[in-house]
Amino acid sequence: QDPYVKEAENLKKYFNAGHSDVADNGTLFLGILKNWKEESDRKIMQSQIVSFYFKLFKNFKDDQSIQKSVETIKEDMNVKFFNSNKKKRDDFEKLTNYSVTDLNVQRKAIHELIQVMAELSPAAKTGKRKRSQMLFRG
Amino acid sequence: QDPYVKEAENLKKYFNAGHSDVADNGTLFLGILKNWKEESDRKIMQSQIVSFYFKLFKNFKDDQSIQKSVETIKEDMNVKFFNSNKKKRDDFEKLTNYSVTDLNVQRKAIHELIQVMAELSPAAKTGKRKRSQMLFRG
């Protein structure tokens, strides 16, 4: 059994998240993940999910009673999602930590926008014709 | 020329982001994107970058002078990054809109954690042995 399972059960107790009523009104993440089978699509969604958990854990960083559980889960996320590549995790965390209200960050983001947009399409899909075909799909 | 280019230039003027000094102290996104060639790694990073721009644009949604530019750029992001797939964009936006301080959201997130973790590794890399190898890389 992966180390995170026991620690996640501990968090369930702490957050009172074990009851069946928690599942009322649908899921947050699981339903969305079920929609996407392509690896690159899954990464788009999982990137947001992992950053959500990191933010959640950050909010409870001073709560000693769950520190070990949180650290174990974060480490296992690092192994599973970032393939234990610290550079990947560091770059990810830099991106999640940029403040959207910081004026210098705003200026930089707008300054880089054209180049960022140019890189958004996967390499195989950069043909203009291909993109214009895409405009009409729901 | 893609439609976003002219509109991004318009935003540069609005944000006073055309000056060379904006590039001082390194880039926000471009340096990070340069580090990642694998499509799935790029999607992890681009997911955070796109959500940053969406948040930034949301903060300026009431500013009429840049509305057309913002809408054009968002639409082009939809074409390029979400492949004009509305379901993909909708799922993405759901994820970005969850509030990490909402108690019900917290409980649901912790309730789903074990299943989310189980799905984090790419299908081909779920072997326990492969993952344990990864524990020791920087």
């Epitope: 180390p3 590549n85 610290k86 | 694998e38 190898q133 920087g138």
Partner: antibody, heavy 120, light 111 residues
Framework: EVQLLESGGGLVQPGGSLRLSCAAS????????MSWVRQAPGKGLEWVSA????????YYADSVKGRFTISRDNSKNTLYLQMNSLRAEDTAVYYC?????????????WGQGTMVTVSS | NFMLTQPHSVSESPGKTVTISCTRS????????VQWYQQRPGSSPTTVIF?????PSGVPDRFSGSIDGSSNSASLTISGLRTEDEADYYC??????????FGGGTKLTVL
């Protein structure tokens, strides 16, 4: 101050066994993954084995897989390398190395090394 | 598996600047951190650069590390060379299937 002190090296015949130890001090031992790296005489560095802080996960280089076993005793702040079926090509200085995920995978602290000679 | 290739030896006079390269054979150099280790004769290795360009405390700022994606290589630059810099220098990195790989080492001679 971090200290890593290896012991247990020596001369052994091909096919024989040795157990290396590394006594650690100056840091919270159980919080860190530990590794063994070796260096044959006049040659470069070669990573041998690693173990997680809890001891629950281990990994080995192909060249030693099935012959070497890494372990740790967190109550004694000690790392071990059990080496069986030794070969001439295992002759090297063996370094005990502390590393941390939060220092970018750099091998931050190295012991002084213990010499293992496999010869008949 | 990939390899990291370093020059066998380099030499330079005291006070000058020397650069040691480390070229990755396959995979992308920038997608994983590179470390550099110094090993003086008869001593254990010590880290002089980690995470591409960061110096551990105690390592002088004469030592700097960099990555060049276009040549798929990392570099260690030592400026203001001193006799005590004479040592072997090793680069090290990893990828998704190989936990750690060391370069073959470069012998730096200070003339």
């Amino acid at each position: 101050e971090v200290q890593l002190l290896e012991s247990g090296g020596g001369l052994v015949q091909p096919g024989g066994s040795l157990r290396l130890s590394c006594a650690a001090s100056g840091f919270t031992f159980s919080s860190y993954a530990m590794s063994w790296v070796r260096q044959a005489p006049g040659k470069g560095l070669e990573w041998v084995s690693a173990i997680s802080g809890s001891g629950g996960s281990t990994y080995y280089a192909d060249s030693v897989k099935g012959r070497f076993t890494i372990s740790r005793d967190n109550s004694k702040n000690t790392l071990y390398l059990q080496m069986n079926s030794l070969r001439a090509e295992d002759t090297a200085v063996y370094y005990c190395v502390k590393r941390s995920f939060d220092s970018g995978g750099s091998f931050e602290y190295w012991g002084q090394g213990t010499m293992v000679t496999v010869s008949s | 598996n990939f390899m990291l290739t370093q020059p066998h030896s380099v030499s330079e006079s005291p006070g000058k600047t020397v650069t040691i390269s480390c070229t990755r054979s396959s995979g992308y150099i920038a997608s994983s951190y590179v470390q550099w280790y110094q090993q003086r004769p008869g001593s254990s290795p010590t880290t002089v650069i980690f995470e591409d360009d960061r110096r551990p405390s105690g390592v002088p700022d004469r030592f700097s590390g960099s990555i060049d994606g276009s040549s798929n290589s990392a570099s260690l630059t030592i400026s203001g060379l001193r006799t005590e810099d004479e040592a072997d220098y090793y680069c090290q990195s990893y990828d998704d299937t190989t936990p750690w790989v060391f370069g073959g080492g470069t012998k730096l001679t200070v003339l």
